[in-house]
Every structure is written in structure tokens, then in C-alpha cells.
Interface confidence: low
């Protein structure tokens, strides 16, 4: 019994589960004797293209009687006056009905498959009686908002007499305009009466910005007596039939608006009809834009003829509805605005895959954006552009798949054809707050596949740790480290050299666990890039990064400069990122600048080597990163601290030296091999690098549309890391406290200072 009830319910409610993807005109209006053409849209899947299409009339009791179908059936009511044509390549079919009568008025469905299965769209057809016109009536049919010119002939005897135009309101004619200068208030500012030259026995009345209320019967008259000349006119003002637009969810739509040269210099707008007659401005040429369309709309520049187009990307369900474009000095719909109309249907059975609409990154970090494209167009050129809201919105190109990269983005932006098969990847690193905004993915092929992604810059620090800009020496070997936290343990780590067509993979060495992450276990990694026999061609940007298969995650960039060997005292490693933007929080200032002192002398970093070479201290050559001495890597007996320097000086120098060294957490030391030097870099500032957690973009973010790669949620980590247990962040000590602690440490060790200083630096 229950089964029977369920079966009945399914029969009665065939389409309650999903919204039908079939779409057509909700209302069709025509006049007796005329023809109509009704277009119905369907998702052009293989099954839909080949299935039966039908047009049926809904009965009072809910059934739907087929009148015509794609399988050749034509009802006797339609014989000889109707046809149905399928256009499978467009996903449309068209029903043409001629010789309409008022009997054709009613409720219909256009649909696919079986009449009762719900894959259909309801259409209301209204056939009205033609106007009962007086003899000799001239009919003017004009679109809403346009201009009409009513011509009124007269005879010579009335040439000098008053000319007038009346409108029939009910039984009475109401004066609209006359040649003595009268203008009816309803027509003020939009009507004029022109009397042609004496040779032509004709006067004209021109009405602009036609309103629906202007429709009706008019009478023009020359003279006021029984000899006057009269002419009847019937003005029909047409509300524009909306053009049906059927687009996929997440896709893109373009409204082409051609209102004519007469409004070329008038402000243009696109609005969306809400309840009643209200039409909310979506965008206009006066700079207004609805917040719901921020980042995903462009009003393309007008042509000389006043035509323009509006592009909307990232279509949402709520974007469906009726849109009007028009021209009016206020930049919004007013009575008498010339308009064009569209009915937008957003197909939820979209062919466009879900992709993150928001991607998050941290200052100094990176994002990897996945962009869908029509897989049938794998050879199309892929583009990425930055949406700008100024004026009417524009989207300047940043990168394309043919190797063009905007100059300001060189070294930090790459468009990769991977993973392919309908998706390409854009990687942007060295992020700053200025990179926040909306970006569009598009191709030179299917314009419906334009998608929008918003990049947000959030609090936190990058996951990958690399030195700043590095200087290599011609002919020698360069080793550049990249530190990967343990959260990336299961991902492929790589180094590559950036160029404008991508990033060419390079061999790299896994050098075991990294000491850069104090709260990380053995799964962290230090992966080094080694360049042997450096040449000029090695100069450029290098990226280290993580990926899984063809899906890319975080990247970090290092610029390698190449210079010739210099004499002693020359530059060792350039670790200060000179070209960082002012607000660029690249890693941490402690690492980018190494506190301007942290690599004063490698010996300071040996566990207990607290005293520096007095000669070096004396001649002030330790003021900056770049001025390290290259003469004495092995340390030397010249540091005769115990015998040549008074103990007070030893204590003072030691306190400063150890203050710097200890403040950098001596144990967290890593080594970069550059030239013949050994430069030890404190990595202490790298702990808790994701205090506020940034999105790693390996897949997507934990935002509006979440996806993750291979189910590995730790790659997303928008707000916290799921694989690391973080130590509570230590409060930063003041420099005074650091100095005091260092001094205490130094006193405890002072008994061994002299001997160890003479032994030279040992490895940390």
C-alpha cells in the first residue's frame, strides 16, 4: 500500500526534486493573424540533444496535450501553420506558430522527453484582438524609449492656419501640441512640431523618449473650421521582448546593448528588475556598481554608435532574472529611457566545474589558483587578468600561456598548462597586500568559461623559508636552501628556474630534516638547489615549491645574481631583499635582514664562541651583512683576547656578541654554502611561521567552495595546522632583556673564552 502511495506521489509531483534546466519565454504576446517564434533552451548533453522535444498545451486538469513534437507529430489544430526545429549544437529548439487566433491564448509547455516528466518550461501565450482602426489610419509601431515622427498632410488653404495634434482619451480628444506653442505637460521636453518648407504641404510631430502611456489614437489637424484637414494615427509603443539568455552556473554572460546613435552621449546602464517595476542598477557609465557584482563585472567601452556590452562572470543562481540596458542622464531606468531586455536563466546543471572563488595567502607567501576552461579548447590561449573597479571596470592582462608576463610581475607570476584536461594553474608569489583583489581566468576560446577568483591576504607567515636575494660567483658552486615544514612531508618538493613561459624544474638535494621549525619533527625538510660552475645564464629567479602530481601548492622565490670574483672583503651573500615592497612581510625582517648583524662573523654562531676578532671589531668592518671578512674562515691565533685585551673590553665585546648570537636562539642554525665561505644563518625566527595560518592553496581554501587535494586537509590549513602541535608563542624579549641574559650567559662561560677563541671557530 505504501509503495502504491509513493508511486502516486511521484506521478503527481514528477519534478519536485530539482529545478528543471529547460528554459524559454515566460510570456509571449501577439496579435491575431500574426506569427510567433518560441525558443526553448536545454543543456546540450548527448542525451538531451537526441531526445524527443515537444510543445504541449496545458489542460484545466493538469495534463498536457501534445500539439507538435520533434518526432514528426503535428496536431490537427496546428496542421499547416506550425513547425518545431531542433538545433542540437546550440541546445535549443524553436516552435513557430502562424495565423494566430485568440483561441491560441493559453498555458503551454516546451520540454524534453515525456510530457509529464518535468523536464519542461511553462509558457503563457496571449493573443489579442487587432486594433479596431478608423479608415485611413496610419499605424506607427515604435519601441519604448525611442522616437516617433507622426506626419500630417494638409491642403494649401490650410497652410497658414493653426496646426495641432490631439490624443483620443476615452471619448474626448486632448490637445497634445499646437503651432501656437502649446505643449501638454505630459509631453514637456520631449515633443516638437515641425512645419516643412512652403513647398511641402506637411507638418510633423516628433515625440522622443516614448512611454508606454503614449500609446493610443492620435488626430492631427490643420485648421479649426469645417475645412480643416484631419489625419488619424495609431501609435503602438512596444515593450521590448526580452531576449532569452541561457548560461551555466559559474560561467559568464555578455549583454550587448545597442540603443542607437541618438543616445551615444547619454549615460548608459544595466539594471536588474526586482519586484514590480523597480530596476536596480547593476552597473552604469557614471561609476555605479552593485556590490553583489564587485569583481565580476565589466562595462566595455562604448562604440561611436553608443553601443556597449556588459560582461558578468562567476554566475550565481541569484543572478537569474530580467535585465534591462538603457540610456538616461541619471544612469538609471526612467520613464522614456530607450531600453533593451534580456531574461537570464542560470542553468544549475553546469558544465563548468566548481573551483574556489576565494583563495587566501599571506604577505610574502604565494597562492596557486586553479582555472577551469573548456576542455574541448585545450589549444586555446589562456589568460589571467586583474579586475580593476575604476570607472566601469576593466581587466588588464597579467600573463598568458604564450609567454607574456606583465613586467611588474616578472619572477613572481607563472601560468602553467598543468594539470591540463580542463584546468590550468596560475601561481603568484612574493605576495603583498596590494595583490589582494579579483582576478579573472579566461581563454581566447569559449567566452562563457570566464571565471573569477578573489585573492585575500591574511595574517601569517609563509610556510617555505628561503634566503633573500643571493649573489653567486662566476665559475663557482652555489647552494641555496629551502626549508619545508613537516606539514608538507607527503608532497613532492622541487626547485625550478622561472622564465616567462613557466618554471623549468631543476635537480635538488634533500638534506634531511630542517632545523628551521622548532615545533616540527623529523618530517620537516631542507632541500637545496645546487648550481655548479655558475655562469651568467644562471642569473634569475628561482622558485622552490611543493606539489602533488600536477597540483601545485606553495612556492617561494629567490633572486640569484651572478658576479665576478672580487678581492677580499667583497660581498658574500645578499640576504637583504632590496626590492621588497614597503609593506612586504617577506618571511620575517629578522631573516630577510639577518638583523643586519646576525652574520657579522660566522664564529659568533659556534656554540660557545663568544668573542670576535678584535681587529675586525676595531676597524668597524662588521656594520652590515655585506661587509664580512673573507680572510680568516679558519679562525686564527690573532684573536689573542686573553692576553692582549683588557678583561673589561672582553666582557663588553662578549656581551654584545653573545647578545646578538643568543638572541637569535643559537641552536637553530642552518648553513648556506656560497663561494668558499660558510655562512651560518639563524633560523630561530621561523618558528610558529603559521601563527594565524594561511591557506596553502593546494587544492583550495576552507572558504565558500572547499576542495582539498587527495583528501589531505592539512594542505588547506586556513586557520590552523592540523599536523603540527604548536608551542605557545614565546613573548619577544626586549633588546635590554636579551642583552642582560646574554651577559649572564657570557659570565658563566668566561673561563673558557680565551682558549676557545684561540682554537678558532668550531661547527655549530
Amino acid at each position: 500500500m505504501l509503495l502504491f502511495v509513493l508511486t502516486c506521489l511521484l506521478a503527481v509531483f514528477p519534478a519536485i526534486s530539482t529545478k528543471s534546466p529547460i528554459f524559454g519565454p515566460e510570456e509571449v504576446n501577439s496579435v491575431e493573424g500574426n506569427s510567433v517564434s518560441i525558443t526553448c533552451y536545454y543543456p546540450p548533453t548527448s542525451v538531451n540533444r537526441h531526445t524527443r522535444k515537444y510543445w504541449c498545451r496545458q489542460g484545466a486538469r493538469g495534463g498536457c496535450i501534445t500539439l507538435i513534437s520533434s518526432e514528426g507529430y503535428v496536431s490537427s489544430k496546428y496542421a499547416g501553420r506550425a513547425n518545431l526545429t531542433n538545433f542540437p549544437e546550440n541546445g535549443t529548439f524553436v516552435v513557430n506558430i502562424a495565423q494566430l487566433s485568440q483561441d491560441d491564448s493559453g498555458r503551454y509547455k516546451c520540454g524534453l522527453g515525456i510530457n509529464s516528466r518535468g523536464l519542461s518550461f511553462d509558457v503563457s501565450l496571449e493573443v489579442s484582438q487587432g486594433p479596431g482602426l478608423l479608415n485611413d489610419t496610419k499605424v506607427y509601431t515604435v519601441d519604448l524609449g525611442r522616437t516617433v515622427t507622426i506626419n500630417c498632410p494638409f491642403k494649401t488653404e490650410n497652410a497658414q492656419k493653426r496646426k495641432s495634434l490631439y490624443k483620443q482619451i476615452g471619448l474626448y480628444p486632448v490637445l497634445v501640441i499646437d503651432s501656437s506653442g502649446y505643449v501638454n505637460p505630459n509631453y514637456t521636453g520631449r515633443i516638437r512640431l515641425d512645419i516643412q518648407g512652403t513647398g511641402q504641404l506637411l507638418f510633423s510631430v516628433v515625440i522622443n523618449q516614448l512611454r508606454l502611456s503614449d500609446a493610443g489614437q492620435y488626430l492631427c489637424q490643420a485648421g479649426d473650421d469645417s475645412n480643416s484637414n484631419k489625419k488619424n494615427a495609431d501609435l503602438q509603443v512596444l515593450k521590448p521582448e526580452p531576449e532569452l539568455v541561457y548560461e551555466d552556473l559559474r560561467g559568464s554572460v555578455t549583454f550587448h546593448c545597442a540603443l542607437g546613435p541618438e543616445v551615444a552621449n547619454v549615460a548608459k546602464f544595466l539594471c536588474r528588475q526586482s519586484s514590480g517595476e523597480n530596476c536596480d542598477v547593476v552597473v552604469n557609465t557614471l561609476g555605479k556598481r552593485a556590490p553583489a557584482f564587485e569583481g565580476r563585472i565589466l562595462l566595455n567601452p562604448q562604440d561611436k554608435d553608443g553601443s556597449f556590452s556588459v560582461v558578468i562572470t562567476g554566475l550565481r543562481k541569484e543572478d537569474a532574472g530580467r535585465y534591462l540596458c538603457g540610456a538616461h542622464s541619471d544612469g538609471q531606468l526612467q520613464e522614456g529611457s530607450p531600453i533593451q531586455a534580456w531574461q537570464l536563466f542560470v542553468n544549475e546543471e553546469s558544465t563548468i566545474p566548481r573551483s574556489p572563488t576565494v583563495v587566501k595567502g599571506v604577505a610574502g607567501g604565494s597562492v596557486a589558483v586553479l582555472c577551469p576552461y573548456n576542455r574541448k579548447e585545450s589549444k586555446s590561449i589562456k589568460y589571467w587578468c586583474l579586475w580593476e573597479g575604476a570607472q566601469n571596470g576593466r581587466c588588464p592582462l597579467l600573463v598568458d600561456s604564450e609567454g607574456w608576463v606583465k613586467a611588474q610581475y616578472e619572477g613572481r607570476l607563472s601560468l602553467l598548462e598543468e594539470p591540463g584536461n580542463g584546468t590550468f594553474t596560475v601561481i603568484l608569489n612574493q605576495l603583498t597586500s596590494r595583490d589582494a583583489g579579483f582576478y579573472w581566468c579566461l581563454t581566447n576560446g569559449d567566452t562563457l568559461w570566464r571565471t573569477t577568483v578573489e585573492i585575500k591576504i591574511i595574517e601569517g607567515e609563509p610556510n617555505l623559508k628561503v634566503p633573500g636575494n643571493v649573489t653567486a660567483v662566476l665559475g663557482e658552486t652555489l647552494k641555496v636552501p629551502c626549508h619545508f615544514p613537516c606539514k608538507f612531508s607527503s608532497y613532492e618538493k622541487y626547485w625550478c628556474k622561472w622564465n616567462n613561459t613557466g618554471c623549468q624544474a631543476l635537480p635538488s638535494q634533500d638534506e634531511g630534516p630542517s632545523k628551521a621549525f622548532v615545533n616540527c619533527d623529523e618530517n620537516s625538510r631542507l632541500v637545496s638547489l645546487t648550481l655548479n660552475l655558475v655562469t651568467r645564464a644562471d642569473e634569475g629567479w628561482y622558485w622552490c615549491g611543493v606539489k602533488q602530481g600536477h597540483f601545485y601548492g606553495e612556492t617561494a622565490a629567490v633572486y640569484v645574481a651572478v658576479e665576478e670574483r672580487k678581492a677580499a672583503g667583497s660581498r658574500d651573500v645578499s640576504l637583504a631583499k632590496a626590492d621588497a615592497a614597503p609593506d612586504e612581510k617577506v618571511l620575517d625582517s629578522g631573516f630577510r635582514e639577518i638583523e643586519n648583524k646576525a652574520i657579522q662573523d660566522p664564529r659568533l654562531f659556534a656554540e660557545e664562541k663568544a668573542v670576535a676578532d678584535t681587529r675586525d671589531q676595531a676597524d668597524g668592518s662588521r656594520a652590515s651583512v655585506d661587509s664580512g671578512s673573507s680572510e680568516e674562515q679558519g679562525g686564527s691565533s690573532r684573536a689573542l683576547v686573553s692576553t692582549l685585551v683588557p678583561l673589561g673590553l672582553v666582557l663588553a665585546v662578549g656581551a654584545v656578541a653573545v647578545g646578538v648570537a643568543r638572541a637569535r636562539h643559537r641552536k637553530n642554525v642552518d648553513r648556506v654554502s656560497i663561494r668558499s665561505y660558510r655562512t651560518d644563518i639563524s633560523m630561530s625566527d621561523f618558528e610558529n611561521s603559521r601563527e594565524f595560518g594561511a591557506n596553502d592553496n593546494m587544492g583550495a581554501s576552507s572558504i565558500t567552495q572547499e576542495t582539498s587535494l587527495g583528501g589531505k586537509e592539512e594542505f588547506v590549513a586556513t586557520t590552523e595546522s592540523t599536523t603540527e602541535t604548536k608551542e605557545p608563542k614565546k613573548a619577544k624579549r626586549s633588546s635590554k632583556e636579551e642583552a642582560e641574559m646574554a651577559y649572564k650567559d657570557f659570565l658563566l662561560q668566561s673561563s673558557t673564552v680565551a682558549a676557545e677563541a684561540q682554537d678558532g671557530p668550531q661547527e655549530a
Epitope: 613586467a407 579566461l442 581566447n444
Partner: nanobody, 119 residues
């Protein structure tokens, strides 16, 4: 609309030189990229060289160092100087102009000019 008129194709010996020219007319002011593509026997149309509105030039790997693309001051004519020609360079060369409309690109093509390199 943009109209493209190509000239300068012809026959050359391997190792020789040819210069192709392409003049744009119509709404040429909006052109973002101008360049050359070629269709060699049995292959689909492939990129050769192009110059962007900011004067950045790109070349296909196969022609780098042999071909040079330049543009007149008014930016409406591009010339492709082809040196050290190889038989593999034989094909129909098409001039291309691309306009970035702010939301998509529109490509315009010339009729094509034949280049034949004999060994």
C-alpha cells in the same frame, strides 16, 4: 575592424634571408599584440614571433636568434626579418593582430604569404 595586408614572401635559398611586412589599417590603435604565425606542410598553424604594445617581443624557440621582429613608430606595421633560413621554415606565414577588449581577445588575420626555402 582591422585589416591586415602582408607582403614580402617568396623564394629563398637555405641560409638566405627574407623580410615579411604586415600593415594594419582600420581600428589599429587598439591592437595589443601583432605578430606572425606560420603553417608548414603537414602541420597546424604555429606561433613564430610577436610584439606587444609595450614593445616586448617573443619568438618561438625554433626561430630565436635567426628572426627579428620590429615595428614602425606608428605601431601599425610590423616587419619580420628572417635570416639563416632553413628548409623547415617553408610554409604560409600569417600576420596576426590581437585586440584585448577588456574581457576577451579578438584575433584578426591576414591572407597569408608563402615562404619557400630551397636547400
Amino acid at each position: 575592424q582591422v585589416q591586415l595586408v602582408e607582403s614580402g614572401g617568396g623564394l629563398a635559398q637555405a641560409g638566405g634571408s627574407l623580410t615579411l611586412s604586415c600593415a594594419a589599417s582600420g581600428t589599429a590603435a587598439g591592437i595589443d599584440v601583432m605578430g606572425w604565425y606560420r603553417q608548414t606542410p603537414g602541420n597546424s598553424r604555429e606561433f613564430v614571433a610577436r610584439i606587444f604594445s609595450n614593445d616586448v617581443t617573443h619568438y618561438a624557440d625554433s626561430v630565436t636568434g635567426r628572426f627579428t621582429l620590429s615595428r614602425t613608430q606608428d605601431k601599425n606595421t610590423v616587419s619580420l626579418q628572417m635570416n639563416s633560413l632553413k628548409p623547415d621554415d617553408t610554409g604560409v606565414y600569417y600576420c596576426n593582430a590581437r585586440i584585448w577588449t577588456g574581457s576577451t581577445t579578438v584575433d584578426y588575420w591576414g591572407q597569408g604569404t608563402q615562404v619557400t626555402v630551397s636547400s
